[in-house]
Every structure is written in structure tokens, then in C-alpha cells.
Interface confidence: low
């Protein structure tokens, strides 16, 4: 009875409820850069203001007939998905539309840039509350479009974009590849990636999360009361723009980094069938489907972290890959991964006043990835402590020696091409939890942080026999900040965090043989912030109203005679 | 945007007297780069976004655009400034022949130039 997409983004315990009040997302303005729209459609009438901005190329073909309903189709549907009276996510959000796509759904990078500039100027002339910009479009990789998105994001605007419908790496497209933009892929009612004809949703490390994007019911421009089903990553992005509007309306002071972390945190985890993605993209693609938070407050105490993958280093011997966190996130740990297993580890290093995570390829390697663990840790003071390769056979050790600093991550980097099988003791000496241990020929880097109320602990899971994957997870209430492998020997492909689980991958068992060299331990560093928890309790004590759990409650809907239309 | 074609001849005449050496030369050792869409059918040659260095003021953007027009006119090329950017990125959008790219890349304040390309509803 309820459209599957609205049910999917609703927190489970609210599914029984029937209603969502008319002002969910009401403190937020959502800008839509798309086709023209039918602003008098009953779904969006009075909710969408059509600006006078228009910058579109001529339609192709001499026989093209401009038909209003076709010209308005894409934008009208998306406006309905974001804020439609019946089928919208954020029914209270106000929208403003800019026309950057023509009647064939085609625009230009330059027209989009001028549109983004128009939004920035409007924001300066008349500052309002939080702004969300929805970009349900994609072109080839564009340095200038990505740069414009970065500037607008740094001005406090939340940009949400479609990952693209090319069944390809989203990093090859813009604005999907802009790191500051929230990039959304599309899934269907079965939580599978959406197939669109011979193509489908884009994927890869530039996608932040997925959202419903197939058979989405929304306003049709065929008539002022018509509805239609459309599919695509635009529809998925519109869901996330709506969810963002709901979150920002409940917490208007949220920064882009905080919003992105919350979107990731409240997503459904590990429900997408990754077999649909190309094998080399599976590890890079987030297995997350967007959902609304169950309530406004209570999220504040959480230590939020996300995993950021670098671009591939390429195969040259000295190639490196760099993963960076957003400006107001802290890099709490750094790891690396190589499919061939040939790598020379990773290290945290300062770049432009911020820590970055750099991974090093090795001779004969096909390339490496750097994996950064990026966290929201207010008032944090983090530094990296390094120990050079040890002379002794015991292995290299480094610990956080400053008062009040705790260990959040361990990295190791080596210059030798192959660490060989010499392995240090896997277990740390008791009473020294703030210590990183590594191979004697590797330099070890400890990420040490001081932040109010921050506490961390090390959790290990060792497998004596060879195994392709070893995992260790942090328990409820703790957040994974660091993920590494012991020992750092050559058969370990690398380590990376997936949500709250540390994954260590090793070479195929058949190639390793079941020697003692197959023993691998996954080491997770789990942290929590007592300070954030306390601040959140104080906030809840002084806040009346029950927030999003009142604002977003699913609707019971009965469907009749809707058409199907794919974009 | 208003159509500037009508004012074009007058503008060119006014700029012809400007000598190349009068304005600042590009900083030593920094070379502006040219970018274009990797997907050939999506390219829109003939329209270019000239992106200037981060701290460039609007007046400098306008001056750089006029300078490009003057130098192009001297070589017998017609150019049209479609938009001057400020607020997000400093720069301008210009309709011109690809033959002028080398010249444009040498202009002062230029960070990079990108050929316009198509975007599509998803």
C-alpha cells in the first residue's frame, strides 16, 4: 500500500504509522538544477518557486517539437520526489528551480556553472536557512564543475548529485566525482543496483551511498494531477536531498561533514548484492542504502567515522595513492590495499596543514589504494608518532607517549620490496594498549589523538590457518577508527574498514599454502567519546519536541493506474 | 545574457591600441593547463571556460577577457565573451576558435582552461 521507496527510507519502527506532517524539512530550501517544471502540478504547487534562471543549449535535430509536458517531465518528477504532497520525502521543504537542461534533458557544464554561481549570489543577497542543491545530471569528468561544487560546498551549501546511469565508475563523471558533493547511486525494491536498459547505476569510490531509484512514483507533467513512475540515479539523489532537508530542518546547524556522516551512519548496511558490480569495484563501492534517522537527537553523542578510498595509484614502482578527509574531519587512521599484494604499506603525512593517508606501490605491483578513516571529533588534537625500522628481531613498536593522547590507528610502511616471513609477536605486551606493533623492517606510524572524553581500545582477531579474509568488529556504542593487519607480511593484501568492521584480506589460500606464514590477525581500534555523549544528554534534557520521529512517519498509500516511464 | 555582437566592432577598435606587453605577464614557471571531456561525443568545441587563479578580482577577470579579445582580433579572430564569472570561481566563458587556446593559456592570471561539454538528465 505504501510506495516501496518511501517505506525503504523510513526507520523500521515507524513503518506502522501512517502520516507525515506537512512541514517536514520546512526550514530548508532545496535548489533544483534541471529541466523546466510544471509548477502548478498538485504535488508541488505552492512548494516550488521557478526562478528566472535559464541557461540551456538548443535542442538537437531539425524535427524536434517542443512539447511542454515533455520539457517539464524530469524536473517535475524530481521536485515531487523531494517535496511532493503525497509522494514526497520532505513535504515541508521549499524548492527553487533553475533551468539548466533543455527539453531533451541536455545541458552544458558552462550553463550548470552559471546556475551554481546564481545560487551563490542569491545566498549572499538574501541569506536564508540551510540550503540543499540537487544536481540530477551528469557529464564527463570536469575539473571546473568539480571546483565550482567545492567552492559552493565550502560556502555551507549541501550539494547532492546523481552518480550517473552509465554502469560505470562514478569517478569518471561530474559532478559525481567531486569529493565535496554527496553522490548517490540507485537501488531497487530488492535492494539491488538499478539496471537501466543495457546500462545502470554508476558505482565505485566516488559514490557516497545508494537510495531508491527504480519505479519511483512521482508527479507527471502530463497533467496537473497525473503521476508516473520513473527510474534513475536522479530519483535516488532526490530521495537523499529530501532526507538531507529533513535532517537539516531538525538540526539546522549541521555542517556538510556532519550531514554526510549521519547519512552514512543511518543507512541500511550490507543489503546490496555486490555481485552486480564489476569485481574490482566491489570493495570500493559503499554498501549503503539511505534512510531517515529514527529521531533527531541521540545521534550527537555518537563518534561518526567513514571510510574514504583513494584513486588507484597506477602500476609504476614508485606510485603512491593519497586519501584525504574533508576539511572538518579528522584522519584517525590510514591503511592500504593492493589486489596483487605487492605494496610497501602506508603512512600518515602532513599536507597543507592537514594529515593525509599515502599508500605506496611496490615493484611488480599493479597498484595500491590508500584508505583513510575520517571521523568527526570536535576539539581534537591529533599527531603522528613514527618509529623507524627496528634493529632487533622483536619488531618495531611505537606508542602514544603524550599525556591524555590515545591511539586511534596504526600504519606501517617499508622500503624493502618484500618483507619476507619474519614476523614479530602478534600479541602486545600486557598493559600497553596504546602501542602499534609492526615488522622489524617497517617504520610504524601511530595516530595519537587528544579530544575531550575520547577513549579507545584495541580489539584483535587472529586466525592461525590461512584465510582470505579476517574480520573484527567494534561492539555497540564503539566506533571503528583504526584497522590494520598483523603481521605486515607480503601475503596480506591490505586492511580496510567497512562500517564498524575491520577487514584484513590475504592472498588466495591456494597460492599461500597452509604454512605458518598464513597466520593473520585483524587489529581494530575502537573508540568512543564520553564528552559527546554527555553533551548530547544535556541537549536532550533542554529540548522539547520529539523531532524527526514526529516529522517523518511513513504513509499508507493505495495505488491505482500509474504509468511506467524510464529515464 | 545580452547579445554583445552589435558592440563587437567598436570593442575591437577600442582594444586594438593595447599592446601585448602592457599587462602583467604570467608568473614565471606556472603554466596554465587545458582540459577537455574524455567522452568525445559530449565535447562542445568552440566554447571555453577560462578559469583564473583563486584570488583574481572581477575587474581583473574582465580585463583578462578584454585582453584575449584584443589579441584575438589582432590575429583576425572573432571572439565573444558570454559570461564573466565571479562569486564562485573567477574567470569567463568565451566563444572562440580552438586556434586561440595557446594564446589564451599564456594570459595573466589564467589557472586552466576547460572546453565546454554536455551534461545530461539522469
Amino acid at each position: 500500500s505504501i510506495p516501496w521507496n518511501l517505506e525503504r527510507i523510513t526507520p523500521p519502527r515507524y513503518r506502522a504509522d501512517e502520516y507525515q506532517p506537512p512541514d517536514g524539512g520546512s526550514l530548508v530550501e532545496v535548489y533544483l538544477l534541471d529541466t523546466s517544471i510544471q509548477s502548478d502540478h498538485r504535488e508541488i504547487e505552492g512548494r516550488v518557486m521557478v526562478t528566472d534562471f535559464e541557461n540551456v543549449p538548443e535542442e538537437d535535430g531539425t524535427r524536434f517539437h517542443r512539447q511542454a509536458s515533455k520539457c517539464d517531465s524530469h524536473g517535475t518528477h524530481l521536485a515531487g520526489v523531494v517535496s511532493g504532497r503525497d509522494a514526497g520525502v520532505a513535504k515541508g521543504a521549499s524548492m527553487r528551480s533553475l533551468r539548466v537542461l533543455n527539453c531533451q534533458g541536455k545541458g552544458t557544464v558552462s550553463g550548470t556553472l552559471i546556475g551554481l554561481e546564481f545560487i551563490r549570489k542569491s545566498q549572499l543577497v538574501q541569506p536564508v536557512g540551510p540550503l540543499v542543491v540537487l544536481l540530477p545530471l551528469a557529464g564527463g569528468y570536469s575539473r571546473v564543475l568539480n571546483a565550482a561544487c567545492q567552492r559552493l560546498a565550502r560556502a555551507g551549501v549541501v550539494l547532492v548529485t546523481a552518480a550517473g546511469n552509465f554502469r560505470d565508475d562514478a569517478c569518471l563523471y561530474s559532478p559525481a566525482s567531486a569529493p565535496e558533493v554527496i553522490t548517490v547511486g540507485a537501488t531497487n525494491a530488492q535492494d539491488q543496483p538499478v539496471t537501466l536498459g543495457t546500462l545502470g547505476t554508476n558505482f565505485g569510490r566516488c559514490v557516497d551511498l545508494f537510495a531508491p531509484g527504480e519505479d519511483i512514483i512521482g508527479a507527471s507533467s502530463d497533467c496537473s494531477t497525473c503521476f508516473v513512475s520513473q527510474s534513475g540515479t536522479s530519483q535516488a539523489a532526490a530521495h537523499v536531498a529530501g532526507i538531507a532537508a529533513m535532517m537539516l530542518s531538525a538540526e539546522p546547524e549541521l555542517t556538510l561533514a556532519e550531514l554526510r556522516q549521519r547519512l552514512i551512519h543511518f543507512s541500511a548496511k550490507d543489503v546490496i548484492n555486490e555481485a552486480w558490480f564489476p569485481e574490482d569495484q566491489r570493495v570500493l563501492t559503499p554498501n549503503l542504502v539511505a534512510a531517515l534517522p529514527p529521531s533527531t537527537h541521540g545521534a550527537g553523542w555518537q563518534l561518526f567515522c567513514r571510510t574514504v578510498w583513494s584513486a588507484h595509484s597506477g602500476p609504476t614502482r614508485m606510485a603512491t595513492a593519497v586519501a584525504r578527509c574533508a576539511p572538518d574531519e579528522e584522519l584517525l587512521s590510514c591503511s592500504s590495499f593492493s589486489r596483487s599484494g605487492k605494496r610497501r604499506g602506508e603512512r600518515m603525512e602532513a599536507q597543507g596543514g592537514k594529515l593525509v593517508c599515502r599508500a605506496h606501490n611496490a615493484f611488480g605491483g599493479e597498484g595500491v589504494y590508500a584508505i583513510a578513516r575520517c571521523c568527526l571529533l570536535p576539539q581534537a588534537n591529533c599527531s603522528v608518532h613514527t618509529a623507524p625500522p627496528a634493529e632487533a628481531s622483536m619488531g618495531t613498536r611505537v606508542h602514544c607517549h603524550q599525556q591524555g593522547h590515545v591511539l586511534t590507528g596504526c600504519s606501517s610502511h617499508w622500503e624493502v620490496e618484500d618483507l619476507g616471513t619474519h614476523k614479530p609477536p602478534v600479541l602486545r605486551p600486557r598493559g600497553q594498549p596504546n602501542q602499534c606493533v609492526g615488522h622489524r623492517e617497517a617504520s610504524i606510524h601511530a595516530s595519537c589523538c587528544h579530544a575531550p572524553g575520547l577513549e579507545c581500545k584495541v580489539k584483535e582477531h587472529g586466525i592461525p590457518a590461512p584465510q582470505e579474509q579476517v574480520t573484527v568488529a567494534c561492539e555497540e556504542g564503539w566506533t571503528l577508527t583504526g584497522c590494520s593487519a598483523l603481521p605486515g607480511t607480503s601475503h596480506v593484501l591490505g586492511a580496510y574498514a567497512v562500517d564498524n568492521t575491520c577487514v584484513v584480506r590475504s592472498r588466495d589460500v591456494s597460492t599461500t599454502g597452509s604454512t605458518s606464514e598464513g597466520a593473520v590477525t585483524a587489529v581494530a581500534i575502537c573508540c568512543r567519546s564520553r564528552h559527546l555523549a554527555q553533551a548530547s544528554q544535556e541537549l536532550q534534557g533542554s529540548t522539547s519536541g520529539s523531532g524527526l520521529n514526529d516529522i517523518f512517519e511513513a504513509q499508507k498509500i493505495e495505488w491505482h493506474e500509474h504509468h511506467h516511464h524510464h529515464h | 545574457q545580452e547579445d554583445e555582437d552589435g558592440d563587437y566592432e567598436e570593442l575591437v577598435l577600442a582594444l586594438r591600441s593595447e599592446e601585448d606587453g602592457l599587462a602583467e605577464a604570467p608568473e614565471h614557471g606556472t603554466t596554465a593547463t587545458f582540459h577537455r571531456c574524455a567522452k568525445d561525443p559530449w565535447r562542445l568545441p568552440g566554447t571555453y571556460v577560462v578559469v583564473l587563479k583563486e584570488e583574481t578580482h572581477l575587474s581583473q577577470s574582465e580585463r583578462t577577457a578584454r585582453r584575449l579579445q584584443a589579441q584575438a582580433a589582432r590575429r583576425g579572430y572573432l571572439t565573444k565573451i558570454l559570461h564573466v564569472f565571479h562569486g564562485l570561481l573567477p574567470g569567463f566563458l568565451v566563444k572562440m576558435s580552438g586556434d586561440l587556446l595557446e594564446l589564451a593559456l599564456k594570459l595573466p592570471h589564467v589557472d586552466y582552461i576547460e572546453e565546454d561539454s554536455s551534461v545530461f538528465a539522469q
Partner: antibody, heavy 121, light 112 residues
């Protein structure tokens, strides 16, 4: 003029179902949501739910959601409310009322004359 | 669910009297985007369907006499009849439409 004309009184046995119709005239049926409100003898008004004729969306009050079904036939501008598994507590006058489908117009400006449903063994 | 509490539940008055009925909601009915209070007042006479008097807390429906006025914002609302006429003796209901729809229990206005 604008009118909502409801079907006649019904007498039903406990456990049975009743289907009340509401025919609209004098305005564009699709432009207004149709609500159903009931009033037990000597009691106040109780909102049951609504249907948006243009999309077919329905929203039901928690108390009725397992027993009520609201439908519409746009070709004859008529809305229907069916209530199943009737008990004597369902004895009431059932009203349909229209609400303009617009953000700020969340009020019922035209009502039907009411349909009396009596549930008795 | 939002609760609506009307008071008094009944009252006796004479023609020409000024009458005030109050309605309290369990949460604010002010829509933050439209800046309107989603509260309406209805009049019902025996054997008849309810009739809309006031919407958005204070806007009179067309055709409703000016002696009827509504006021209030947030959680506290008032319906005032400035000078009672014989045809005004009826039951009055307030109704919230901020989250779902809930009616007050009604106020019966009788002739003294």
C-alpha cells in the same frame, strides 16, 4: 452548485461490511481530497481517513486502518468508504467532506449530508 | 496523536451575549514553513452536517457572519461570538490538521 451526495441509510449485522458512497458535483473531483468523518450517537466527530482522488493515495487513522478501505471512481466523481468486521460500536452517522488539495487548505469546506449506519443483530 | 481539549464542554447563554470557547492542543499547530496555525472551527446543529466557520485559527470562511472570530497561536486558541443570535445555538468543534486530523470533544452552546 458544489454538493456531496451520500448513499442512503444502512442496517448491518455484526461482522458484516458496509460500503458508503459519496458523489461529488459542481467542482473538479480530482482537485480535492475526500475525507471521511463519523459521529456516534450523542458523541463528537472522529476522523477516519482520506483519499486523494488524483493519485489514489489513502491515509487512514490508526484506529481504522485494518478495517477501512477508501476508493474512488474518477469517471463518475464518486468516493467510497468500506468498513468491514462491523460491531455495534460502529453505529454512527458517516460523513464525507472535501478538502482542497493545497498546502495551506487543511480544512473541510463542504460536507455530505451523512449516512446513518446501524449495526444490530 | 495530537490531543485537542475544548472548554467548557457545555455552556448556557442568552441572545446578545458575548461567548468564548477555548481549545488547547497537546503540541504546537504552527506550521513553520507557511507560518499558519492549522486549526479550524466548525458549527454543527442537530441532525445536520458540520459547517466550517474559521480556518488557519483566525480566517473566517466566506459567508460566515463577522460576529464569529478566531484567535490564538501555537497551542491555545479561542472562538468568540461577539453577540449571540438565536441561530448560533449549536455544538462547536475545533479541529487540528497539523498531524493527521483530530477534533475537540465539542462545546454545546444552549439557550439560558
Amino acid at each position: 452548485q458544489v454538493q456531496l451526495v451520500q448513499s442512503g441509510a444502512e442496517v448491518k449485522k455484526p461482522g458484516a461490511s458496509v460500503k458508503v458512497s459519496c458523489k461529488a458535483s459542481g467542482y473538479t473531483f480530482n482537485d480535492y481530497w475526500m475525507h471521511w468523518v463519523r459521529q456516534a450517537p450523542g458523541q463528537g466527530l472522529e476522523w477516519m481517513g482520506y483519499i486523494n482522488p488524483s493519485s489514489g493515495f489513502t491515509k487512514y487513522h490508526q484506529n481504522f486502518k485494518d478495517r477501512v478501505t477508501m476508493t474512488r471512481d474518477t469517471s463518475i466523481s464518486t468516493a467510497y468508504m468500506e468498513l468491514s468486521r462491523l460491531t455495534s460500536d460502529d453505529t454512527a452517522v458517516y460523513y464525507c467532506a472535501r478538502q482542497y488539495d493545497y498546502d495551506e487548505d487543511w480544512y473541510f469546506d463542504v460536507w455530505g449530508q451523512g449516512t446513518t449506519v446501524t449495526v444490530s443483530s | 496523536d495530537i490531543q485537542m481539549t475544548q472548554s467548557p464542554s457545555s455552556l448556557s447563554a442568552s441572545v446578545g451575549d458575548r461567548v468564548t470557547i477555548t481549545c488547547k492542543s497537546s503540541q504546537s499547530l504552527l506550521n513553520s514553513r507557511t507560518r499558519k496555525n492549522f486549526l479550524a472551527w466548525y458549527q454543527q446543529k442537530p441532525g445536520k452536517a458540520p459547517k466550517l466557520l474559521i480556518y488557519w485559527a483566525s480566517t473566517r470562511e466566506s459567508g460566515v457572519p463577522s460576529r464569529f472570530s478566531g484567535s490564538g497561536s501555537g497551542t491555545d486558541f479561542t472562538l468568540t461570538i461577539s453577540s449571540l443570535q438565536p441561530e448560533d445555538f449549536a455544538t462547536y468543534y475545533c479541529k487540528q490538521s497539523f498531524n493527521l486530523f483530530t477534533f475537540g470533544q465539542g462545546t454545546k452552546l444552549e439557550i439560558k
